[in-house]
């Protein structure tokens, strides 16, 4: 139940692969609002194009719980950290000249894409194991931001809190259908 | 707080094809999975098609295969349900039905108030 | 396809106890199957009360709980008040495609 008000898991990370951050509360929509459907809006400083700019994206391999209950697996999660620069100055861009310029936009790194992902949990006293869909993102990107994008849209892009568009692949008007009924047919 | 509001009631011919559209707000279309269900008059909810966020595509029900196209217009977060060669059969109240945005992956949590189509000669 | 099981309909006293269950022709239902419970009332749509077998929501009262009994997802209400009065759907997962049940009326007298 506690899942609809806050993300009711502990942060277990596996030892030796640092420290995760916190998930926000949930039923917080300004935090969880994308803007612009994820696409990232017009700006006559759009100059270069998105592929040149890149941001980290850090691996976290932790064990997901749900109240007492915890995944029989870890699970590894993506988290989109730091600022965006031309990719061939992120390996080493500390101590750089600011590349944007001063009244152009800024650039963050958020999550693109999520995924679901089956998730088993196993609960304690011999009760019942519990099966879950966890969201995890799946890619990150550099977003373009100006100052004159509002406050409660800088809120969006601390780790974790953005919520990410779907995993979906590309469409001109209408997805692609699974056409594979195996599943279904010969299921379980 | 998502908020799901369809386009009204249709009449049609057997034959014809129908589109009922479903405006999403609160969130973005691209945040949500969006899910078609439908419910023909004094019968039970049948699942007609939806995004599936484990694979990236939209499924569709074996009964529709060919017959339904679910789309999605970004740009204005409207969803999309057309189905085609309709017969009296298709007569119900369509509902899409959106997830929560949440940790955990959890379906059907937000419906349309219903689109009623009639398919009659 | 596969074909989702529910009691056509059950009676339960106010403040007594029921338990609606949903079958799958496949076999036995598991928690891979996510099972959902929905609740509807005449002239409106569908509202969630159970997902993922037993997890509630905040909408849902207390009355209301989930669980699997004897291969069969099962929501059980117990302290029925008359506006439980209702048709209750369960809806299964297969591996991306949803399968609802025929409905249980649930009558309350």
């Known amino acids: 139940q506690g899942w609809q008000a806050f993300r009711n898991d502990a942060t277990e990370v596996i030892p030796g692969l640092g420290e995760y951050p916190e998930p926000p509360p949930e039923n917080n929509q300004t935090m969880n609002r994308a803007e612009n459907g994820g696409r990232p809006p017009h700006h006559p400083y759009d100059a270069k194009d998105v592929s040149e700019y890149s941001c980290r994206e850090l691996h976290y391999t932790r064990f997901l719980t749900d109240g007492p209950c915890r995944s029989a697996k870890p699970v590894t999660e993506l988290v989109c950290s730091g600022q965006c620069g031309p990719a061939r100055l992120l390996p080493n861009a500390i101590g750089r000249v600011k590349w944007w310029r001063p009244n152009g936009p800024d650039f963050r790194c958020i999550p693109d894409r999520y995924r679901a992902q089956r998730v088993q949990l196993l609960c304690p006293g011999g009760a019942a194991p519990r099966s879950r869909k966890v969201r995890l993102v799946a890619s990150c990107k550099c977003k373009r931001l100006t100052r004159f994008h509002n406050q409660s849209e800088l809120k969006d892009f601390g780790p974790e809190t953005a919520r990410p568009q779907k995993g979906r692949k590309p469409r001109p008007g209408a997805r692609g259908a699974k056409a594979n009924q195996a599943e279904l047919e010969n299921a379980y | 707080e998502v908020q799901l509001v369809q386009s009204g009631a249709e009449v049609k011919k057997p034959g014809a094809s129908v589109k009922v559209s479903c405006k999403v707000s609160?969130?973005?279309?691209?945040?949500?999975?969006m899910h078609w269900v439908r419910q023909a008059p004094g019968k039970g909810l049948e699942w007609m098609g939806g995004f599936d966020p484990e694979d990236g595509e939209t499924i569709y029900a074996q009964k529709f295969q060919g017959r339904v196209t679910m789309t999605e217009d970004t740009s204005t977060d409207t969803a999309y349900m057309e189905l085609s060669s309709l017969r009296s059969e298709d007569t119900a109240v369509y509902y899409c039905?959106?997830?929560?945005?949440?940790?955990?992956?959890?379906?059907?949590?937000?419906w349309g108030q219903g689109t009623l189509v009639t398919v009659s000669s | 396809q596969a074909v989702v099981t529910q009691e056509p309909s059950l009676t339960v006293s106010p403040g007594g106890t029921v338990t609606l269950t949903c079958g799958s022709s496949t076999g036995t239902v598991t928690i891979d199957h996510y099972p959902y419970w929905f609740q509807q009332k005449p002239g409106q749509a569908p509202r969630t009360l159970i997902s993922?077998?037993?997890d509630k929501h905040s909408w849902t009262p207390a009355r209301f709980s989930g669980s699997l009994l004897g291969g069969k997802a099962a929501l059980t209400l117990s302290g029925a008040q008359p506006e439980d009065e209702a048709e209750y759907y369960c809806l299964l997962d297969y591996g991306g495609r949803f399968v609802f049940g025929g409905g249980t009326k649930l009558t309350v007298l």
């Open positions: 993922d077998t037993d």
């Open positions: 609160g969130y973005t279309l691209t945040e949500l999975s």
């Open positions: 039905a959106t997830d929560t945005v949440g940790y955990w992956e959890k379906f059907f949590q937000h």
